[in-house]
Each structure stands twice: as structure tokens, then as C-alpha cells.
Interface confidence: medium
């Protein structure tokens, strides 16, 4: 077996981090590979150990217990098949960071001209994340779901006012949300469960 | 509160061995990285040696291959066998918890918790 | 292994005074970096952590800084209770070490 290239590492950066390897040959990840880790601010820490799973045929995918994160953690990592090493090295969970998806989207009704959209932040305030995340909301209609409008929501309460008259009378729409870290490197996390209503409004006279 | 008490030190002779103990109380002792620290006559501090939770263990250049630090996490007991002694060994030695602290952007660690000390004197 | 070197070794000062004591690393240890006070006749205690970071209860007019390769502790306005021997300890890399301490008198 060989390891081909690095692997692709990300962090929720609260308790998790994901690491995927490509292989050059079919492999049963759980049985053949095993995957040793430790934080490096402790010389003497015990090594964690984590055990793969297959993502596909040639492909392995490792979920990493890695308890509150802080900025300068770095872990260093020894991917071994039996007695072999096949790959070493090391990742920051800072640096490369997928938050946790939003969830408990909901809508309420503001005022009467009004939509409020409203979401959970997953990261405890003692957490970078917590006062870190912008959010992008995206509302489609369920039947063309390329009809869409994206808001990008730099601030940092997790909620969304939007006029009833901005979407079509008479028609269901989908939310949907996701998030990023401003401050720290990484990607848009995975997009919330949605939502769907029906959005109904009562036209002007003029335009009946 | 946390407690650490010393104790198995002694006059003992060049070449004699002794064990010592350090009886830990008031917090998870499982979960802490514990140490030895001492102090010769009228000198400054000098780290001997350290254990992690798990039983990971380091040791200062001066006592490596003399001295044998363990714990015993269901007594709650942190040892330190001392063999081969030198008149040099002679010292007040401490057991010293080791604290844990992490804010955003790093963590830090130090020496949280100091015993009270056990004297040993290795001499003829 | 990494050496702290410490100054002054002694020194005396009145009360009220700013004091500075210095340790110096042999390579760098970023911020990691605690400092110690032993007090005549007592265990040491904690005073400082991360270099600048103040452990809980202990006064404000004791202060930490520095990185890298150096770094202080600083007490504004020294009292008589703090008549001490202090430490720096370098907890960066194994083996741990410490400064050979800084005894400080009152004038």
C-alpha cells in the first residue's frame, strides 16, 4: 500500500478533525491502517490513536478526537499499515478550519411585511468561533431551485430580516445556511437542514 | 483543596537508594502531569523529573539512568526511586503539580501546586 | 538543552521601588515562560505563567513580559512581604529549566 500525496485534513475546531488519504490500491482502512496522534505542546502526551474507515475503495478517512483547540496547536500524525509507516506529518486545526453546520433554522414572522430568519451557532462562547462566524443564507423556490437570492450575513447575530415582497406571492420557498471563520483559514461548513414555507402576501390593489 | 505531601526522605549513604512519596489530594490526580523538583542547601531549584498522566516520563540529564520517577493513580501517589546517590543528590525535594491553561491563541503550562518538601542527605 | 540564565543574582531596593529581574534563553521559547517566588523558609509559588499571564490571587503590581529569548518580571512598588527568592522556569522543551534565581532584598 501507498500513501498518494497528503492527505486533506479540516477541523470543526471544537472537537473533531477529518483527515482523508488517497490510495494507490483497493484497502479495508479499519483492518489494514491505523492512524497515531498527539498534540505536540505536550513532548510527553500519550498517543491518540484513531481508526480509518473506508470513504471509497482506495480511499481512507480518519474522524480525530481533538478536545478545545487554541490557535498554536499543531498535531503530529503517522499513518501505519501493521508495522510499516506509510505517511508522516502534521496539521493545525486553525489552519485549515469547516465549521460546524447551523442548525434550527427558523423562520418567524417580524413585522407584518417582514420575514425573520433565525439559526443556532453550535460553538460555546468560550470558543473562538463563537463571535467568529459569518453566515450566508440562501432562500430558492422549491420547485426551481435555481431561482435563488443569497444573503451574506457579516454580523455576527445569527438572524436574517427580509421583506415578504421580496419573494413571489403564492409560492413555497427553501432556506437554507451556512458558515465561515473570519479570522481563522478554511472553508464554508456544510449547509444547515432547510427549511420550506409558503410565502403569501396580499398585493397592492394596483397590481391585482 | 489540592494537597501534595512529601515524604521517604532521610540520611542515607553515597551509593544507597531511597524512595520517595508524594500523597495527592483534592483534585482528578489521573488527569495531571506530576514532578519533581529540588532544592540543595542554600541553592536555587532544579527540575529532576516529570510524568504524565499516563505514565510518560521525563527525566533531568543529571539523574537519568539513577533515578525512576512513577505514580500509582489509583492511591493517588506520585513515587520517585532514587538510586545510586551522590552526595550532589543531597536536597529538599518537592512534588509539584503541573497546571494547564489555554486561552484563543495558545496553551500554556506550569508548576501550579508546590508540596512542602522532604529532606534527603546522602553522606558518609 | 536550553539554559536560563538569570540577573540579577541579587539585589536590593526600597520600598515602593520598580523592580526588573531578567532571565535569558539560550534559544527561543516563545511565551513559555512561568516565574516562581520562594519566600525565606517556604515552597515556591506561582506567580506568572505563559511570561505575562498573572496566576490567580497574586498582586497586581507583579507583572511578566517579554518573548522569544527574553524576558521579565516586574514588580511596581515593592512591598516587604515581597522578600523573596524569584525563579524563571522554561517549560518549552525538555528538560524543563530554571534560572538560578534572584534574591531580593529591602533596603
Known amino acids: 500500500i501507498k500513501v498518494l500525496g497528503e492527505p486533506t485534513c479540516f477541523s470543526d475546531y471544537i472537537r473533531t478533525s477529518t483527515c482523508e488519504w488517497f490510495l494507490d490500491s483497493a484497502v479495508d482502512c479499519s483492518s489494514q491502517l491505523c492512524l497515531h496522534y498527539r498534540l505536540m505542546f505536550f513532548e510527553f502526551s500519550e498517543n491518540l490513536t484513531c481508526i480509518p474507515r473506508n470513504s471509497a475503495s482506495t480511499v481512507c478517512v480518519c474522524h480525530m478526537e481533538m478536545n478545545r483547540p487554541v490557535q498554536s496547536d499543531r498535531y503530529q500524525m503517522e499513518l501505519w499499515a501493521e508495522h510499516r509507516q506509510l505517511w508522516q506529518g502534521s496539521f493545525s486545526p486553525s489552519g485549515n478550519v469547516k465549521p460546524l453546520a447551523p442548525d434550527n433554522l427558523t423562520l418567524h414572522t417580524n413585522v407584518s411585511d417582514e420575514w425573520l430568519l433565525t439559526w443556532n451557532n453550535l460553538y460555546p462562547s468560550n470558543n473562538l468561533l463563537y463571535k467568529d462566524l459569518i453566515s450566508m443564507v440562501n432562500i430558492s423556490r422549491e420547485d426551481n431551485p435555481a431561482e435563488f437570492i443569497v444573503y451574506n450575513v457579516t454580523y455576527k447575530e445569527p438572524r436574517l430580516s427580509f421583506p415578504i415582497n421580496i419573494l413571489m406571492s403564492g409560492v413555497y420557498y427553501t432556506a437554507r445556511v451556512r458558515v465561515r471563520s473570519q479570522i481563522l483559514t478554511g472553508t464554508w461548513s456544510e449547509w444547515s437542514p432547510s427549511i420550506t414555507w409558503y410565502n403569501h402576501f396580499q398585493l397592492p390593489l394596483i397590481q391585482r | 483543596q489540592v494537597q501534595l505531601v512529601e515524604s521517604g526522605g532521610g540520611l542515607v549513604q553515597p551509593g544507597g537508594s531511597l524512595r520517595l512519596s508524594c500523597a495527592a489530594s483534592?483534585?482528578?490526580?489521573?488527569?495531571?502531569?506530576m514532578n519533581w523538583v529540588r532544592q540543595a542547601p542554600g541553592k536555587g531549584l532544579e527540575w529532576v523529573s516529570a510524568?504524565?498522566?499516563?505514565?510518560?516520563?521525563r527525566y533531568a540529564d543529571s539523574v537519568k539512568g539513577r533515578f525512576t520517577i512513577s505514580r500509582d493513580n489509583a492511591k493517588n501517589t506520585l513515587y520517585l526511586q532514587m538510586n545510586s546517590l551522590k552526595p550532589e543528590d543531597t536536597a529538599v525535594y518537592y512534588c509539584?503539580?503541573?497546571?494547564?491553561?489555554?486561552?484563543?491563541?495558545?496553551?500554556?503550562?506550569?508548576?501550579?501546586?508546590w508540596g512542602q518538601g522532604t529532606l534527603v542527605t546522602v553522606s558518609s | 538543552d536550553i539554559q536560563m540564565t538569570q540577573s540579577p543574582s541579587s539585589l536590593s531596593a526600597s520600598l515602593g521601588d520598580r523592580v526588573t529581574i531578567t532571565c535569558q534563553a539560550s534559544q527561543s521559547i516563545r511565551p513559555e515562560i512561568s516565574w516562581y517566588q520562594q519566600k525565606p523558609g517556604q515552597t515556591p509559588k506561582l506567580l506568572i505563567y505563559?511570561?505575562?499571564r498573572l496566576q490567580t490571587g497574586v498582586p497586581s503590581r507583579f507583572s511578566g513580559g517579554g518573548s522569544g529569548t527574553s524576558f521579565t518580571l516586574t514588580i511596581s512598588g515593592l512591598e516587604a512581604e515581597d522578600l523573596a527568592t524569584y525563579y524563571c522556569?522554561?517549560?518549552?522543551?525538555?528538560?524543563?529549566?530554571f534560572g538560578q534565581g534572584t534574591k531580593l532584598e529591602i533596603k
Open positions: 522556569l522554561q517549560d518549552y522543551s525538555w528538560p524543563y529549566s
Open positions: 483534592g483534585f482528578t490526580f489521573s488527569s495531571y502531569a
Open positions: 510524568i504524565s498522566g499516563g505514565g510518560s516520563t
Open positions: 505563559g511570561a505575562s
Open positions: 509539584a503539580k503541573s497546571g494547564f491553561y489555554s486561552d484563543y491563541e495558545r496553551r500554556y503550562r506550569y508548576l501550579e501546586v
